[in-house]
């Protein structure tokens, strides 16, 4: 599941990881664009083993994964503000 939406909360992530997470281990991804209280983009990944991690948005693997997910759903996602689940 991929979720992208704007939030009025402050930054959620206190530390970030660049370590690759295989797709089969991921349950949900949340993208929080910069702004509205947090000066940076945040990517939060829920793993199937009931753990959660903030991923460095600059990590190549997450950028590739996001691109694949965006292409898969580009025809259905509204712009610029959206919250969408992608199986």
């Amino acid at each position: 599941v991929l979720e992208v939406y704007y939030t009025s909360l402050r930054c959620r992530c206190v530390q970030e990881s660049s370590v690759f997470i295989p797709r089969r281990f991921i349950d949900r991804i949340q993208i929080l664009p910069r702004g509205n209280g947090c000066p940076r983009k945040e990517i939060i990944v829920w793993k199937k083993n009931k753990s959660i991690v903030c991923v460095d948005p600059q990590a190549e693997w997450i950028q590739r994964m996001m691109e694949v997910l965006r292409k898969r759903s580009s025809s259905t996602l509204p712009v610029p503000v959206f919250k969408r689940k992608i199986p």
């Epitope: 959620r12 992530c13 206190v14 990881s17 949900r28 829920w46 083993n49 009931k50 959660i52 903030c54």
Partner: antibody, heavy 122, light 107 residues
Framework: QVTLKESGPGILQPSQTLSLTCTFS??????????VGWIRQPSGKGLEWLAN???????YYNPSLKNRLTISKDTSNNQAFLKITNVDTADTATYYC??????????????WGQGVMVTVSS | DIQMTQSPSSMSASLGDRVTITCQAS??????LIWFQQKPGKSPRPMIY???NLANGVPSRFSGSGSGSVYSLTISSLESEDMADYHC?????????FGSGTKLEIK
Amino acid sequence: QVTLKESGPGILQPSQTLSLTCTFSGFSLSTYGMGVGWIRQPSGKGLEWLANIWWDDDKYYNPSLKNRLTISKDTSNNQAFLKITNVDTADTATYYCARSEIVMPYVPFDYWGQGVMVTVSS
Amino acid sequence: DIQMTQSPSSMSASLGDRVTITCQASQDIGNDLIWFQQKPGKSPRPMIYYATNLANGVPSRFSGSGSGSVYSLTISSLESEDMADYHCLQFKQYPFTFGSGTKLEIK
């Protein structure tokens, strides 16, 4: 307001089964990311994690006790349960239930019950 | 399993003292550590999460530090209300494991 409260038998004999109930309010175990865990503390000693149950009925157990533990939930009644079979005097402790919510920042066991004292004695 | 070795097991300090409690993990836990405070007869409450971040309502005299496998909780100037047991918890992987606890007493 999140609250949790444990209940149990108080006293039981060796070889019996300990049944504990955690009744909570202020959150739902049907909500994504929500879980309840059980932790125990023998008098004057440290904390020991026992088990977690999650919104999707995923369960995790302490392997040192796994074959004696069963965790379950009743989502509609806002309750979680722990059973420990074949108890011994070493199981005498205060038993706590605690909430965990998988959000960022992740703080496992952010809310705790008051604890219930369980004594195993012959 | 990840073992958490906490020291000291007990200590006595005077009001205003700087106090440090340490937890050492048997492997790198990547800051996935929480410090709990437990006052006599009460349930534990989280004080510091992800090794260095103060939970809501925690006085600024508390701080956390460390990385890798060694982590510390420091009280910069001890106050009487800080008399309590302190426990570390690693949540890097299951089974979650606590340190053995530190009993902090006031001289």
